[in-house]
């Protein structure tokens, strides 16, 4: 978990002020209006490990 203004969240996640932690961009499929989803639009997803 990252505080705002410090190192960015890991790939596939974005900072949520509501949750006070890095949140999963994957959850924007079910909850597109979450405060962190705008930050996910610019961030690449975490890669699949096949």
């Amino acid at each position: 978990e990252q505080a705002p203004g410090t190192a960015p969240c890991s790939r596939g996640s974005s900072w949520s002020a509501d949750l006070d932690k890095c949140a999963d961009c994957a959850s924007c499929r079910a909850r597109p209006h979450s405060d962190f989803c705008l930050g996910c639009a610019a961030a690449p997803p975490a890669p699949f490990r096949l």
Epitope: D18, A26, A30
Partner: antibody
Framework: EVKLQQSGGGLVQPGGSMKLSCVAS????????MNWVRQSPEQGLEWIAE??????????HYAESVKGRFTISRDDSKNSVYLQMNNLRPEDTGIYYC??????????WGQGTTLTVSS | DTVLTQSPASLVVSLGQRATISCRAS??????????IHWYQQKPGQPPKFLIK???NRDSGVPARFSGSGSGTDFTLNIHPVEEDDTAIYYC?????????FGAGTKLELQ
Amino acid sequence: EVKLQQSGGGLVQPGGSMKLSCVASGFTFSYYWMNWVRQSPEQGLEWIAEIRLQSNDYPTHYAESVKGRFTISRDDSKNSVYLQMNNLRPEDTGIYYCACRYADYFDHWGQGTTLTVSS
Amino acid sequence: DTVLTQSPASLVVSLGQRATISCRASQSVSTSDYSYIHWYQQKPGQPPKFLIKYASNRDSGVPARFSGSGSGTDFTLNIHPVEEDDTAIYYCQHSWEIPPTFGAGTKLELQ
């Protein structure tokens, strides 16, 4: 530390009623979808009910097996979620867990409470 | 409903070896970016413990010995090297739609 503390459960006769409660702490309760999941040797882990957020007028979802008999509710001012179970059947016997999820995975679970439906 | 089929039902592995658990979905549970499969570990008398989200991302505090992979309909949980503390039942779960369903579980035992 996230904690989900459950209460309720016990022995009830077929056709009877029971209410389960779950009090949450350690996270922003009002942002999370709250769920009840039950476990039995016959059915394994079975999701049975979910209640979402106040911002959407608390939409609820139920498994077909409990629809019309069980009612999930929440009180954000008390960080609590409830499961009212009516017209109970023997096949409702099992361990009941409350669990939270933001959207997809159940990251925290209560300790579980046992319900036995038997005459 | 999306049905998750786990195999094997039980697995006996020697200490330090690899345990491989499969979870197959009755329909695709992946987008181009993410797979909506999650893994849990349950020990006797305890609730399930969340391990891996979105097929391959470990929860904080979960040892690197646990890894997940897969997309579409076929997913795998690997544990290597297996330790004594890993004796448990492992479940997959999807969040593709309502209802979210679980696999029947795989019981991992040590030889």
